[in-house]
Interface confidence: low
């Protein structure tokens, strides 16, 4: 594979050794310039699986809020705007990075983080298991 | 509210102004411990808005792979097993933070980016703009 | 503690305008969702507007649609109401609310009056 | 936009039950949240009952939400009525882009 040489004018390693500590600037840059804000405000309602926001908030992670998708119900909509219980709505699950502080309640301290989070709700057929 | 104090054996901030500049320990902790690893490993086949996962691989970003979801129809999967255009898959984003190697190349020096991703489809009624 | 408290509120006469303010502490502002409700005399509850936390979505009832416009400045922890061609039937008390989730008020402030006479 | 429809006024004696309805004109109330405001008089509102059956911390127990699929409706029901209960009642729901307040309750303490 091709090795990128490091660059020169990187700051110095405070700690040769894992774990391994970078320095990470926390002024974030925001990739999604050309994205609709709007682009998916309504899918938790019009969705077929619909679901909830609840709010998530802890004051040692970072971002400190964190948004969690929970299904209204076990079946999904059907076209008559019941609910079905032939079908199941199932949260899509994703594991995404967080700021943790480390030592806690540290401004400038952190270690990364992996949580699973429940983004949104997605109609699926049940895995039917047959009684023998 | 609560006033957490700030624990005296935090390390010094070296950079007191923005863009600040945090230490994090790159040894990650995972606290999904308790989760099913095939928590969803199936849903992008049985759902109704059934998905592909495409990788994205980027050196210079932590992590540096990342899975796209792209919905497979644009309609839905009815009962039948056809895809019902009365009804739309749409992907399901979320804004992720990732770590980008600033200054390029640099082993121990990031910046926080929001980037948009695609974690699955949900099925939803589409938008019906009548005409006047 | 959440705290919002509103101001500029007053006399105004019909055709003219009027900027609410909302100062909020307690709470990281930026995350939330924020709305304006008011109260005519005597009446109900009247939802008006809603902006996202980011302030990149903005809600309006049909009754205030092109002459109102609500948005934030997350650098000073305040909401807005810009209320322009206002109209008697504006006259209320008009409060400022942190959303729980969208649709939700979960805080309220005190309000403040504004009427709409010649 | 659809409409939310509640009683203007409820009368019970202190220590009974009292259930106030709220009956949502068009689309489905199952779909959407519905939460229960409280105002006393001179008093700014303050929620009750949120996520159709959710009390906030510091509301007592003895009030509890419900819906109604069938009869596309949301209650309030307040047990062990007390003195202080008496004001005026709220439901509230919305839909992705518009929010939407019933006309209010009276709720008399007798």
């Known amino acids: 594979g091709i090795t990128i040489p490091r660059n020169p004018g990187c700051p110095n390693s405070e700690d040769k050794n894992f774990p391994r500590t970078v320095m990470v600037n926390l002024n974030i840059h925001n990739r999604n310039t050309n994205t609709n804000p709007k682009r998916s405000s309504d899918y938790y309602n019009r969705s077929t699986s619909p679901w909830n926001l609840h709010r998530n908030e802890d004051p040692e992670r970072y971002p400190s809020v964190i948004w969690e998708a929970k299904c209204r119900h076990l079946g999904c909509i059907n076209a008559d705007g019941n609910v079905d219980y032939h079908m199941n709505s199932v949260p899509i699950q994703q594991e995404i990075l967080v700021l943790r502080r480390e030592p806690p309640h540290c401004p400038n301290s952190f270690r990364l983080e992996k949580i699973l989070v429940s983004v949104g709700c997605t109609c699926v057929t049940p895995i039917v298991h047959h009684v023998a | 509210g609560i006033t957490i104090p700030r624990n005296p054996g935090c390390p010094n901030s070296e950079d007191k102004n923005f863009p600040r500049t945090v230490m994090v320990n790159l040894n990650i902790h995972n606290r999904n411990t308790n989760t099913n690893p095939k928590r969803s490993s199936d849903y992008y086949n049985r759902s109704t808005s059934p998905w592909n996962l495409h990788r994205n691989e980027d050196p210079e970003r932590y992590p540096s792979v990342i899975w796209e979801a792209k919905c497979r129809h644009l309609g839905c999967i009815n009962a039948d097993g056809n895809v019902d255009y009365h009804m739309n898959s749409v992907p399901i984003q979320q804004e992720i933070l990732v770590l980008r190697r600033e200054p390029p190349h640099c082993p121990n020096s990031f910046r926080l980016e929001k980037i948009l991703v695609s974690v699955g489809c949900t099925c939803v009624t589409p938008i019906v703009h009548h005409v006047a | 503690e959440v705290q919002l408290l509103e101001s500029g509120g007053g006399l105004v006469q019909p055709g003219g305008s009027l900027r609410l303010s909302c100062a909020a502490s307690?709470?990281?502002?930026?995350?939330?969702?924020m709305s304006w409700v008011r109260q005519a005399p005597g009446k109900g509850l009247e939802w008006v507007s809603a902006?996202?936390?980011?302030?990149?979505?903005?809600y309006y009832a049909d009754s205030v649609k092109g002459r109102f416009t609500i948005s934030r400045d997350n650098s000073k922890n305040t909401l807005y109401l810009q209320m322009n061609s206002l109209r008697a039937e504006d006259t209320a008390v008009y409060y400022c609310?942190?959303?729980?989730?969208?649709?939700?008020?979960?805080?309220w402030g005190q309000g403040t009056m504004v009427t709409v006479s010649s | 936009n659809f409409m939310l429809t509640q009683p203007h006024s409820v009368s019970e004696s202190p220590g009974k039950t009292v259930t106030i309805s709220c009956t949502r004109s068009s689309g489905s109330l199952a779909n959407y949240y519905v939460q229960w405001y409280q105002q006393r008089p001179g008093s700014a509102p303050t929620i009750v009952i949120f996520a159709n059956n959710q009390r906030p911390s510091g509301v007592p127990d003895r009030f509890s939400g419900s819906i109604d699929s069938s009869s596309n409706s949301a209650s309030l029901t307040i047990s062990r009525l007390k003195t202080e209960d008496e004001a005026d009642y709220y439901c509230?729901?919305?839909?992705?882009?518009?929010?939407?307040f019933g006309g209010g309750t009276k709720l008399t303490v007798l």
């Open positions: 307690g709470f990281t502002f930026s995350s939330y969702a």
């Open positions: 509230q729901s919305y839909d992705p882009r518009v929010v939407v």
């Open positions: 902006i996202s936390g980011s302030g990149g979505s903005t």
């Open positions: 609310a942190r959303d729980l989730i969208w649709g939700v008020a979960g805080s």
